[in-house]
């Protein structure tokens, strides 16, 4: 069965300055490739973080994702601004020069509140 | 740099008990995936355990189930083998090896030779 | 298990291609290690099918495709004479495998 992306909350607030946790699990580690997190969709989205690297600042992962049998790909994003705020998409891809997207949660908007 | 330095080879007897380090230095040894993997005379490579990033989640081949265990102490940025009930099939180059974030290896000790021998 | 040459050889300037088959494209990644002499430390030099470490030279580059792995040395030196190994882990298993090694000659 095709592997599952599930992101549970369609939408989280965050007050600016405070930090967020983005859900995302799998039903299934197959097929092998990456995991990532997106804003925005279309040719302009961002790159948020990537499991495969661990340099993006502000936003670590959650659980361990070293465990093997690892299916919580849940991100915190640290010291939000106003500018964090926009919909949230965890992606997963299959291996390949270039990995090729298979399936993406749902999506989560962050709303960013003032202080 | 990323540097591993393999340590604790000996020369034991067979039935005897031995215990491999590994100091780790020039990267987060907490965020890292570790692997033991070992080289007979004469032979190939073989994977023997691995260990996630916290500790809490080992694999190992079947082979070596039940007898060597993997450990780590991200305090003092160290793995560890400890290998019970070794026998003369167990003689071999043991090398520790940082994972990728897929479970391959990107950087190698450089080796600890353990013989068993009666 | 992963299968590999035992042996191939090439002129220096050449390019040589070794193959590593055995693993399920769904399932698996590919590596590629370099051993010098026996005993001495592996050096990795590709991972995650394609990907290589930033002090290998560009010459080393790996593919995957079905069951099989390549390694590709575009204008082999006599500096790259090793054992080449093909590693794979398989995410259904969670295990690691190695081939028996290739040994590089450079004539």
């Known amino acids: 069965t095709e592997v599952k992306v599930i992101q549970p909350e369609k939408s989280v607030s965050v007050a600016a300055g405070d930090s967020t946790v983005l859900n995302c699990t799998l039903t299934s580690l197959l097929p092998v490739g990456p995991i990532r997190w997106y804003r925005g969709v279309g040719q302009s989205r961002q790159l948020i973080y990537s499991f495969t690297t661990e340099h993006f600042p502000r936003v670590t992962n959650v659980s361990d994702a070293t465990k093997r049998s690892n299916l919580d790909f849940s991100i915190r994003i640290s010291n939000v601004t106003p500018e964090d705020a926009g919909t949230y998409y965890c992606v997963k891809f299959q291996r390949g020069s270039p990995d090729t997207e298979i399936q993406s949660g749902g999506g989560t908007e962050v709303y960013v509140l003032a202080k | 740099d990323v540097q591993l330095v393999d340590s604790g080879g000996g020369v034991v007897r067979p039935g005897e008990s031995l215990r491999l380090s590994c100091a780790a230095s020039?990267?987060?040894?907490?965020?890292?995936?570790m692997s033991w993997v070992r080289q007979a005379p004469g032979k190939g490579l073989e994977w023997l355990a691995g260990?996630?990033?916290?500790?809490?989640?080992?694999y190992y081949i079947d082979s070596v189930k039940g007898r060597f265990t993997i450990s780590r102490d991200n305090s003092k940025n160290s793995l560890y083998l400890q290998m019970n009930s070794l026998t003369a099939e167990d003689t071999a180059v043991y090398y520790c090896?940082?994972?990728?974030?897929?479970?391959?290896?990107?950087?190698w000790g450089l080796g600890t030779l353990v013989t068993v021998s009666s | 298990a992963l299968t590999q040459p035992a042996s191939v050889s090439a002129n220096p300037g050449e390019t040589v291609k070794i193959t590593c088959s055995g693993g399920?494209?769904?399932?698996?990644?590919y590596g590629w290690y370099q051993q010098k002499s026996p005993g001495s430390a592996p050096v990795t030099v590709i991972?995650?099918?394609?990907k290589r470490p930033s002090d290998i030279p560009s010459r080393f580059s790996g593919s995957a495709s079905g069951s099989a792995a390549t390694l590709t040395i575009t204008g082999v030196r006599v500096e790259d004479e090793a054992v080449y190994f093909c590693?794979?882990?398989?995410?259904?298993?969670?295990?690691?495998?190695f081939g028996a090694g290739t040994t590089l000659t450079v004539l």
């Open positions: 590693g794979a882990y398989d995410g259904r298993t969670y295990i690691n495998t």
């Open positions: 090896a940082r994972e990728t974030w897929n479970h391959l290896f990107d950087y």
């Open positions: 020039g990267f987060t040894f907490s965020s890292y995936a």
């Open positions: 991972h995650s099918d394609d």
């Open positions: 399920d494209y769904y399932s698996t990644y």
């Open positions: 260990i996630s990033a916290g500790g809490s989640d080992t």
